[in-house]
């Protein structure tokens, strides 16, 4: 699965929430960022995430699509120089400071389950998705023969129109 260009084809600033409308928030604690899944107080502003969209080619062994076998991959950055990354050993999702080019662990295949819900599949571990477990983000293995619609891997993106990365 190779990224076909080093720069994103588009970017958007969005808030990220679970299928059950809990917010994904990011907090700086002891010089590292923690990720929380929580009900937001009404007056609290939602945290923003910069989504960068990249085109990716299916491995030719996997698909007969040839030039058309493209997927959208995203990276998610809630604050400058930090990106969500898959830790496949620990089955966890972590925020790490990185320089470009970003490691493969920072890329997720975008799945539109419905028009307004998305899932994020780990580039480094196909079949493993960002999901919600015990009020935290985790990596969750999904059996493709089962329904990909399990709510704990579904997220909503609410795009924010003025695009300034903090």
């Amino acid at each position: 699965m190779s990224i076909t260009g080093i720069s994103p084809i588009t970017e958007s600033l969005a808030s990220l929430s679970t299928y059950n409308d809990q917010s994904i928030t990011f907090a700086l604690e002891d010089e590292s960022y923690e990720i929380y899944v929580e009900d937001l107080k009404k007056d609290k502003k939602k945290d923003k995430v910069l989504l960068s969209y990249y085109e990716s080619q299916h491995p030719s062994s996997e698909s007969g699509d040839g030039v058309d076998g493209k997927m959208l991959m995203v990276t998610l950055s809630p604050t400058k120089d930090f990106w969500l990354q898959a830790n496949n050993k620990e089955h966890s999702v972590e925020l790490h400071k990185s320089e470009k080019p970003l490691p493969d662990q920072a890329f997720f295949v975008l799945h539109n389950r419905s028009f307004n819900s998305v899932s994020f599949e780990s580039k480094t571990d196909p079949g493993v998705f960002i999901g919600v477990k015990d009020n935290h983000l985790a990596l969750i293995k999904v059996d493709y023969s089962e329904n990909l619609g399990s709510e704990n891997i579904l997220f909503k993106l609410s795009e924010i129109h003025h695009h300034h990365h903090h």
């Epitope: 299916h58 058309d68 028009f115 795009e159």
Partner: antibody, heavy 121, light 106 residues
């Protein structure tokens, strides 16, 4: 090579039904959202319906809701549009299109040649 | 629902001209916009996706730009084979086409 072949169009009386089929080849069908778009004679394009890659989510133009049903058979690489209670304003060429990206509802990259549906008494 | 308005509805230009087609959305569509070309008697063909990305096999004289609600398709040097109707199309919220711009030769 990507190919989409629509069939099932024809002349039908108002109030009757018609089922369109679109057979796909040249790509991994089950990975892609599929769409129906129509074009009335001499007019512009109008999105009609969408279905996600596993068939679990479907979307419709307001004017066809409750009358049209989109479905797919991933084993047979086919997407369908069942059209009931047809009206004269449904007269159009109906195109089938595939999503631009695997798993994604963003954009569509290939279109079939279309099948003409004429609703007239 | 998002409405897409294309202008002009008909455009006459000469071979070699730089041609600009406009598409305006009723709400911000976050660059979720494509352009397609339809020649008489043919199915539409994708030219540009996500506002400014050229579809494989499309000549580089075609380019797209824009953001928010305002988008543009530019043909840097019009060729006879570019005579067609051009449609913009948004997929930010539902799926909606513009009314089209018919491009003809002077």
């Amino acid at each position: 090579e990507v190919q989409l072949v629509e069939t099932g169009g024809g002349l039908v009386q108002p109030g009757r039904s018609l089922k369109l089929s679109c057979v796909a080849s040249g790509f991994t069908f089950s990975n892609y959202w599929m769409y129906w778009i129509r074009q009335a004679p001499g007019m512009g394009l109008e999105w009609v319906s969408s279905i996600n890659n596993d068939g679990g989510n479907t979307y419709y133009l307001d004017s066809v809701k409750g009358r049209f049903t989109i479905s797919r058979n991933n084993a047979e690489n086919t997407v369908y549009l069942q059209m009931n209670s047809l009206r004269s304003e449904d007269t159009a060429t109906y195109y089938c299109a595939k999503g631009h990206y695997s798993y994604s509802s963003y954009s569509f990259s290939y279109w079939g040649q279309g099948t003409l549906v004429t609703v007239s008494s | 629902d998002i409405q897409m308005t294309q202008s002009p509805s008909v455009l006459s230009a000469s071979v070699g001209d730089r041609v600009t087609l406009s598409c305006k959305a009723s709400h911000n569509i976050n660059k979720h916009l494509d352009w397609c070309q339809q020649k008489v008697g043919e199915a539409p063909k994708l030219l540009i996706y996500f506002t400014n990305n050229l579809q494989t096999g499309i000549p580089s004289r075609f380019s797209g730009s824009g953001s928010g609600t305002d988008y543009t398709l530019t043909i840097s040097s019009l060729q006879p084979e570019d005579v067609a109707t051009y449609f913009c199309f948004q997929y930010n919220s539902g799926w909606t086409f513009g009314g089209g711009t018919k491009l003809e030769l002077k």
